[in-house]
């Protein structure tokens, strides 16, 4: 059982109050988290409540005002960024965000020091990327998908590239596709340690077809969006790295780095790049058919003034039973020799565990082992390593932080954080400081999430960063729903799942089931975690039972459950929670009569198959945003997990897997079908092809569009979104209004 | 161009009072802690005090010798920064530099200096 | 008090040589340390601070190193405008006190 926040008795019950639609919509019981922005080893800046940004040194206790409020009000600034000399910041305004990570803005710089805006080559207008280099107060940044240089802020800039187009060639900042499904930022330009060099990606979408789809905006015409997106089995986009030397950037250009032979004979993808040194840099290239990787190490060859990745460096990294990693490929976290590294991978059991590499990947040596993953390594000192996981207790949706000590053998291996704070944090994240001599520990729950700053030495904790006392006494007068996390043993299958329950909740009645269901590959929805949200107002408020499964194709239990959905989308995800259904009606308080399922993006696709399922375990359901056919989706995402539409690859699988094809199958059921017509991600072209199909097949159904909303459904959408979606179930379970 | 300018200086009798000013440009002065040094004929240089911007508290802190004599205090609105010194000693003759700390822990500006002679 | 421990109190050197000069804390005081140069009936100017990082438009002959106690300034080769009086101080906390100082005289 998983305990949330401490109830008052009973006596005192007639004053609790139940979590109303207007809560979740306004935010009323939203938590606050605090992520150091470190800036040294003992020191690091915030943004303070009236919004002055503020230095904190841990070690003198000292807080010192860097820029004043007045200072980021005069140009709007939402955000900034410190040169690490200290010399300069950058205020950042105008957001205009475009796609889940990029967005452009106008950049200010203001010279601490005296206190004045820079004048003189400002920057131009909008940036799509900018960013201090590492040492110093060298500015990188992307303009018009070109890449631009600055020695310092007030000098004129040295361009760097020249045949950036606008939806053809992107220098510095990733494509759609890189962006969404592969590099997960908004940049694709790496800055040497030291800032000697600049590392960047060229991406060429000259012959990716193009999605287009309408903007209606106020205008007499609707716009027409156009983006290079290339979906299952398109054209691809080629992708050049280059290097160049920041110090004397005219002097020979940039410098391409070679891809490795046995990557380039086919279609490829560049992964990621992480420096080692100023001098040495590593990078990760995968097949098209992402079941091999490969990680290679280059050095930079100074009589000729170029970069030589031999193959004594190159690490091959390949899946037999699925795709090459978890979701991504994991990174390399280098140790202090600048050769050998730290890898999360699959072990022979089919674990992904830390591995360390020092000649070669068949020699790595397994730092952590059993039935359960390491999740992210996030620092390497010279004597610790710090990785998260879920060992602690055998729960697959905890994160706990743990130390091994690499620098005595054999290596020790402590639990930094399973019994600070057992109870209420039982999933935990970590920012370190400059050698990690600080952190910070953020907890997300299940109790109300908690931040807070520890040495890096003894672990001690040194001060609580912020603790949402002001959530802690909002919560106290409301009815919030219990919550269980337990599992389902089923043909040698473990299906965890998260139950949320209204606060009287007695066994012995009989209550509607939603189902919310994600269920993507390498994704996992039931976890350890705080929340107050939508499904946590229809168990307060409206009585529902809310269940959420992790079945096959989720992460972090093993490659047996991960890979199971391998080539095979929308078959074993939806047959598990479809049984995990038939486990909860076995329980005795569902009343069978009223169980729903819902589900965005993934878990739209998800629930539009299980509704199409034909087992009459549903009365209705809601797909928000769904995938409906694995063809209209993009092609490093779809391919990873469902190979190739091709007849000599798996053409018929995602033929057999679209929702269309189950149109007749929604004649029973209540169904509610919902996207935004400018859905970048997830076409509207998905949601427009199941309306067809059911339109052809005389099915009735329900839908809502939003006009100009994207995947995210944000501002008044969500409220209109929720409200409607609300209105449907309650219909649906017979609930008055 | 950041400029720090002391005055008030001069020749005060043992136990008389004086009140040196550091008029600031160039930065911005309301986030600045700023600092007292001095320095007596032919010796070292001899930290005095400092106070920190209003924003981080605006409190203050001195050396030994003259803690409880001296009081250091500001007005932003005009850009400048005292010293206010009771109880002169004929010890306390010096050269007195302001200075701003910057927060990378450095005495980065300072001013010419403004001497004081404290003698019968 | 932090005591600032600074050696030697002079030095006779010639325009070409190497010179060295050391600070000792009382207390350990990690990287909060500067070194200052001072000419006669000037202000003092900062070279060094946090230990090893050249101040703008100090030349590359001066460097800086140590942390925790035992600090020390190096001038790799002496030039004529070098002739002055350097002072160690600590950063970490007030009073910020300095070394008594190095007199650089010409040999």
């Known amino acids: 059982i998983v305990l949330r926040p401490s109830r008052v008795h009973n006596s005192e019950e007639n004053t609790m109050r139940a979590l109303t639609l207007k809560d979740i919509l306004n935010g009323t019981f939203s938590y606050k988290t605090f992520f150091p922005n470190w800036i040294s080893g003992q020191e690091y800046l915030h943004q303070s409540a009236d919004n002055n940004i503020v230095l904190y040194n841990i070690e003198t206790g000292q807080s010192y005002t860097i820029l004043s409020n007045r200072t980021m009000k005069s140009v709007n600034a939402s955000n900034y960024g410190l040169s690490p000399d200290r010399q300069f910041v950058y205020l950042e305004s105008d957001y205009s965000k475009l796609w889940r990570y990029s967005y452009t803005a106008t950049y200010y710089i203001y010279d601490l020091s005296n206190g004045e805006f820079v004048r003189g080559n400002e920057l131009p207008r909008p940036i799509q990327y900018l960013c201090w280099s590492p040492v110093g107060s060298k500015l990188a940044y992307v303009y018009q998908n070109n890449i631009y240089l600055k020695q310092r802020p007030g000098d004129p800039p040295f361009q760097i590239t020249f045949n950036g187009r606008e939806n053809k060639i992107f220098n510095g900042i990733p494509d759609w596709v890189y962006e969404e499904e592969m590099l997960a930022t908004k940049y694709a330009l790496w800055w040497s340690p030291n800032g000697k060099f600049l590392a960047y990606a060229e991406f060429n979408d000259t012959d990716i077809p193009v999605i287009a789809y309408s903007y209606y905006g106020d205008e007499q015409y609707p716009r027409t969006i156009n983006i290079p997106y290339p979906k299952a089995g398109a054209k691809n986009p080629v992708v050049r790295i280059f290097i160049i030397d920041t110090t004397y950037p005219a002097y020979v250009g940039p410098q391409e780095v070679p891809v490795p032979a046995m990557i380039a004979s086919s279609d490829y993808y560049f992964s990621w790049l992480t420096w080692v040194t100023d001098e040495r840099v590593c990078l990760q290239w995968l097949k098209r058919v992402q079941n091999v990787s490969v990680l290679s190490i280059c050095d930079f060859r100074e009589d000729w003034q170029t970069w030589d990745c031999p193959k004594t460096q190159e690490h091959i990294e390949e899946s037999r039973t699925g795709w090459a990693g978890g979701f991504f490929v994991s990174t390399p976290v280098f140790s202090y020799d600048a050769i050998s590294y730290y890898k999360i991978f699959s072990d022979k059991d089919g674990y992904k565990h830390i591995h360390y590499i020092k000649d070669t990947v068949e020699n790595a040596i397994q730092i952590t082992s059993g039935k359960w993953e390491a999740i992210n390594i996030f620092r390497v000192t010279q004597d610790s390593l710090f990785y998260s996981s879920n060992e602690f207790e055998e729960y697959p949706g905890r994160r706990n932080i743990y130390r091994i000590s690499i620098g005595s053998y054999p290596p020790s291996k402590k639990c930094v954080t399973c019994h600070l704070r057992k109870e209420r944090c039982q999933y935990y994240t970590a920012s370190f400081s400059d050698y990690a001599k600080y952190y910070a520990l953020v907890c997300y729950g299940p109790g109300i999430p908690i931040s807070t700053l520890h040495d890096g030495r003894t672990d001690q904790e040194i001060k609580i960063l912020e603790e949402n006392k002001e959530l802690e006494n909002a919560l106290k007068n409301i009815q919030l729903p219990k919550e269980e996390i337990k599992k389902l043993e089923v043909d040698e299958i473990t299906l965890w799942y998260k139950m949320i329950l209204p606060p009287q909740f007695d066994r012995s009645k009989k209550y509607p089931l939603l189902i919310q269901v994600y269920g993507g590959p390498c994704s996992q929805s039931v976890r350890s975690v705080f929340a107050v949200n939508w499904i946590s107002y229809l168990a307060s408020k409206e009585g529902m039972v809310i269940a959420l499964v992790d079945g096959r194709g989720t992460a972090f239990q093993g490659d047996k459950l991960l890979y199971a959905v391998y080539r095979k989308l929308g078959v074993y995800e939806v047959e598990d929670q479809i049984t995990a259904v038939r486990k909860f009606i076995e329980m005795g308080f569902i009343d069978e009569k009223r169980i729903a399922i819902w589900g965005w993006s993934y878990g739209g696709y998800v629930s539009s198959l299980a509704l199409a399922s034909g087992t009459g375990l549903f009365k209705c359901g809601i797909a928000v945003a769904p995938v409906s056919s694995w063809e209209y989706y993009a092609s490093v995402y779809t391919e990873r997990f469902m190979g190739l539409p091709t007849k000599d690859d798996n053409l018929e699988h995602y033929k057999n897997s679209t929702v269309m094809a189950r149109a007749e199958y929604f004649r029973n059921v209540d169904y509610l079908l919902i996207h935004g017509t400018a859905d970048d991600n997830v076409h509207f072209q998905n949601s427009a092809q199941i309306a067809k199909a059911l339109v052809n097949a005389q099915v009735d159904f329900q839908a809502m569009w939003y006009s100009d909303q994207n995947h995210g459904l944000s501002g008044l959408s969500t409220n209109h979104l929720y409200t409607h979606m609300t209105h449907f179930l309650k219909q649906c379970f017979s609930l008055s209004d | 161009e950041v400029q720090l300018v002391e005055s008030g200086g001069g020749l005060v009798k043992p136990g008389g009072s004086l009140r040196l000013s550091c008029v600031a440009s160039?930065?911005?002065?309301?986030?600045?802690?700023m600092n007292w040094v001095r320095q007596a004929p032919g010796k070292g240089l001899e930290w005095v005090g400092h106070?920190?911007?209003?924003?981080?508290?605006?409190?203050?802190d001195y050396a030994a010798p003259v803690k409880g004599r001296f009081t250091i205090s500001r007005d932003d609105s005009k850009n400048t920064l005292y010293l206010h010194m009771n109880s002169l000693k004929t010890e306390d003759t010096a050269v007195y530099f302001c200075?701003?700390?910057?927060?990378?822990?450095?005495?980065?500006?300072w001013g010419q200096g403004t001497l004081v002679t404290v003698s019968s | 008090d932090i005591q600032m421990t600074q050696s030697p109190s002079s030095l006779s050197a010639s325009v070409g040589d190497r010179v060295t000069i050391t600070c000792r804390a009382s207390?350990?005081?990690?990287?909060?340390f500067n070194w200052y140069q001072q000419k006669p009936g000037k202000a003092p100017k900062l070279l060094i601070y946090?230990?090893?990082g050249l101040q703008s438009g100090v030349p590359s002959r001066f460097s800086g190193s140590g942390s925790g106690t035992d600090f020390t300034l190096t001038i790799s080769s002496l030039q004529p405008e070098d002739f002055a009086t350097y002072y160690c101080?600590?950063?970490?906390?007030?009073?910020?006190?300095f070394g008594q100082g190095t007199n650089l005289e010409i040999k």
């Open positions: 106070i920190k911007s209003r924003a981080d508290g605006g409190s203050t």
């Open positions: 200075s701003r700390f910057y927060w990378n822990y450095v005495l980065d500006y």
């Open positions: 160039g930065f911005t002065f309301s986030l600045a802690w």
């Open positions: 207390q350990s005081i990690n990287s909060y």
């Open positions: 101080q600590q950063s970490y906390s007030p009073p910020y006190t």
């Open positions: 946090a230990a090893s």
